[in-house]
Amino acid sequence: ALDAAYCFRNVQDNCCLRPLYIDFKRDLGWKWIHEPKGYNANFCAGACPYLWSSDTQHSRVLSLYNTINPEASASPCCVSQDLEPLTILYYIGKTPKIEQLSNMIVKSCKCS
Amino acid sequence: ALDAAYCFRNVQDNCCLRPLYIDFKRDLGWKWIHEPKGYNANFCAGACPYLWSSDTQHSRVLSLYNTINPEASASPCCVSQDLEPLTILYYIGKTPKIEQLSNMIVKSCKCS
């Protein structure tokens, strides 16, 4: 799996999970989240060469097409596979509220 | 939806469905499929600017992060959303066989 266990341990130019820390205020301009101040969002990036972690039949076909037709612009792309939620604390006036934001953290990637 | 109805009618640099015809023999080296000789596989390509058809909370966050940090390499990518199967005819010796290959045709795209 193209997850932290594999990607953060290996120097990998191909599609892999990349570390990305997002500071809510500085990076998103969000002042409404009280805690945490930021989080490890991560992201997916890298080349999708011939059959590298291909996701669907179509991405495998596209990967093969690209190998046989190297001048083609039609190639799979490195995107998130497994995502996890992030629990945040914010305030409505003086009242604290805990909320779970879905699909905020990327845990693994794929070529799709 | 970033489907044929929208994308094939509009000239669109952003993430959209692109037409792609694949000839099984010429483009994939597959001799075993008898019919069809090829098919409209399509593919997804184009830029994913701020909130352009963002798929998940993470891709929306990444899109916003990219707007505020334009030098960052972390940006969403244009990939397939809806896929459809393709029915093929092949031969086992002289005996014809019909098979449905799943996820072979891209019908729409998203930024993920």
């Epitope: 093969l64 | 001799k31 075993w32």
Partner: antibody
């Protein structure tokens, strides 16, 4: 050049399973069909089945249906043959071979063979 | 399943001789579903002929194949010492693929 490299010799007890790999290099693995054939002095060559990589369509000879599983891992260019419920009559040299392109076809490249001995 | 019968089961010939091996199918294969292989002791089979009459790449022109329906022939026009081997026919018109029992060719 085209190479099909198979796993080494194996000894198994009756009732057990064996899994042989066939790693391809030097050609586009996903464009060809991989057939599996075994050879014994008594029976000669027996075709077991074939697998189409990427789409994972497998075709089996009737006599092996139910105890033979053919798969292909496109990420490693490797085909696998698993034979279950082994009997002494399954002692043979097992070959993988790439076909000329069709599901049933002539076979132009062969692996070096894997000797499987079934003995208690 | 289709039975493939080869004849002769063995033969001995001299260098320069013309050698013919025949293969008979228990039912019609059409014109192009037959292959011939050469196997030397301890070696893997080598494809000689496919589609009944097409030579595989790199196969010397002294090897030729002919036939259709149920009767097929492999001919070696002028025997060379390195042609000592067992020759097999194979049909792929119907599942399962089946092979002949082999013809062992010895060089005198």
């Amino acid at each position: 050049q085209v190479l099909l490299v198979q796993s080494g010799a194996d000894v198994r007890k009756p009732g057990a399973s064996v899994k042989i790999f066939c790693k391809a290099s030097g050609y586009t693995f996903t464009s060809n069909v991989i057939s599996w054939v075994r050879q014994t002095p008594a029976q000669g060559f027996e075709w077991m089945g074939g697998v189409i990589p990427i789409v994972d369509i497998a075709n089996y000879a009737q006599r092996f249906k139910g105890r033979l599983v053919l798969t292909a891992d496109t990420s490693t260019n490797t085909a696998y043959m698993e034979l279950r419920s082994l009997k002494s009559a399954d002692t043979a040299v097992y070959y993988c071979a790439s076909t000329l392109g069709l599901v049933l076809d002539a076979m132009d490249y062969w692996g070096q063979g894997s000797l499987v001995t079934v003995s208690s | 399943e289709i039975q493939m019968t080869q004849s002769p089961s063995s033969l001995s010939a001299s260098p320069g001789d013309r050698v013919t091996i025949t293969c008979r199918a228990s039912q019609s294969l059409g014109s192009s579903y037959l292959a011939w292989y050469q196997q030397k002791p301890g070696k893997v089979p080598k494809l000689l002929i496919y589609g009944a009459s097409s030579r595989a790449p790199g196969v010397p022109s002294r090897f030729s194949g002919s036939g259709s329906g149920t009767d097929f022939t492999l001919t070696i026009s002028s025997l060379e010492p390195e042609d000592a081997a067992t020759y097999y026919c194979q049909q792929y018109a119907d599942s399962p693929i089946t092979f002949g029992q082999g013809t062992k060719l010895e060089i005198k």
